[in-house]
């Protein structure tokens, strides 16, 4: 029988490589029975998660699953880091496996500093 | 009924390189991290890398990083696993396993594929 | 990477014997989820791997209730609390907390 405990589908130590200035829908699958739960969105910084109150968010339906989205118009470059959703149920938390956002910052990825510049910022090369 | 079905063994000469198929069934592949391991005769498991067939993000062994390449076709819910340059201490059984990627649920195996690298 | 010990190589037993492989990891295998993602496989001659325990203590399906998992941190054990003909095999521990995953040398468990 299936459970009817809320379940979120975020892979654990998934990944997501984006370019900043693309538009980007970062989705938290909801597995859900009766009442559709109250679902955040926070980023990691260190151990604590920091809840992202003044976001674009929607829900997306589906026939077995619905989604909260995250959206990201235009991907910044300090959108970079983990996210992880976060659905109350019952007076429960329940958490998602943090999932991880890489950006490419389109413009300093096509002006590459040269190697003088390179040698005079070491802290570059690590 | 769950499976990891593997293309049949290969025999290959030093420096070519072989493509090990897998295709899966039972489960939908993008619920899952496919990963790719092998064995050498008589020897442990070794971690080879692991692809998300969901978005294709793939992690490799520092080992096979430039060498490995694996990939998979969600259509045809089916992992391959490319190695070049292949040298003779590469004779091995290699596996794919799938893991359910969201709350470990399962891990499936595949039967293995023996590729033996040989002049 | 972490490196992953098991003990003993292999182990000689009889059938109906309490059996305990340990695992030893070079770092924490504890993830940010507060999980230690450590496996134990079993594998027979010519056979592929199968995975019997997931998350240090959890019983894949299937899998009898003579084995059992534990352990936390750093170290961890496998136990068969009576031995069955069909147990013996090599089992190895794996981690995929941190990559790259690793898998520990396997102990070989045979028939005394």
């Known amino acids: 029988k299936e459970s009817c405990d809320v379940q979120l589908y975020i892979k654990r130590q998934s990944e997501h490589s984006i370019l900043a200035g693309d538009p980007f829908e970062l989705e938290c699958p909801v597995k859900y029975c009766a009442n559709r739960p109250h679902v955040t969105w926070c980023k990691l910084n260190g151990t604590t998660c920091v809840k992202l109150e003044d976001r674009q968010t929607s829900w997306k339906e589906e026939k077995n699953i619905s989604f909260f989205i995250l959206h990201f118009e235009p991907v910044l470059p300090n959108d970079n880091g983990s996210y992880r959703c976060s659905a109350n149920f019952q007076s429960n938390l329940i958490e998602s496996h943090s999932t991880t956002l890489y950006v490419t910052d389109v413009k300093s990825a096509s002006e590459r500093p040269s190697k003088d510049e390179m040698a005079s910022r070491p802290w570059l090369l690590y | 009924q769950v499976q990891l079905v593997q293309s049949g063994a290969e025999v290959k000469k030093p420096g070519s390189s072989v493509k090990v198929s897998c295709k899966t069934s039972?489960?939908?592949?993008?619920?899952?991290?496919i990963h790719w391991v092998r064995q050498a005769p008589g020897q442990g498991l070794e971690w080879i890398g692991r692809?998300?067939?969901?978005?294709?993000?793939?992690k490799y062994a520092q080992k096979f990083q430039g060498r490995a390449t694996i990939t998979a076709d969600e259509s045809t819910s089916t992992a391959y696993m490319e190695l070049s340059s292949l040298r003779s201490e590469d004779t091995a059984v290699y596996y794919c396993?799938?893991?359910?990627?969201?709350?470990?649920?399962?891990?499936?195996w595949g039967q293995g594929t023996l590729v033996t690298v040989s002049s | 990477d972490i490196q992953m010990t098991q003990s003993p190589s292999s182990l000689s037993a009889s059938v109906g014997d309490r059996v305990t492989i340990t695992c030893r990891s070079s770092?924490?295998?504890?993830?940010?989820?507060?999980?230690?993602?450590l496996n134990w496989l079993q594998q027979k001659p010519g056979k592929a791997p199968k995975r019997l325990i997931y998350?240090?203590?959890k019983l894949d399906s299937g899998v009898p209730s003579r084995f059992s998992g534990s352990g936390s941190g750093t170290d961890f054990t496998l136990t068969i609390s009576s031995l069955q003909p069909e147990d013996f095999a090599t089992y190895y521990c794996?981690?995929?907390?941190?990559?790259?995953?690793?898998f520990g040398q396997g102990t070989k468990l045979e028939i005394k």
């Open positions: 039972g489960f939908n592949i993008k619920d899952t991290y």
């Open positions: 998350l240090v203590s």
């Open positions: 770092q924490s295998l504890l993830d940010r989820d507060g999980k230690s993602y």
């Open positions: 396993a799938s893991y359910e990627g969201y709350y470990e649920r399962f891990g499936y």
């Open positions: 692809n998300d067939p969901a978005n294709g993000n793939t």
């Open positions: 794996w981690q995929d907390t941190h990559f790259p995953y690793t």
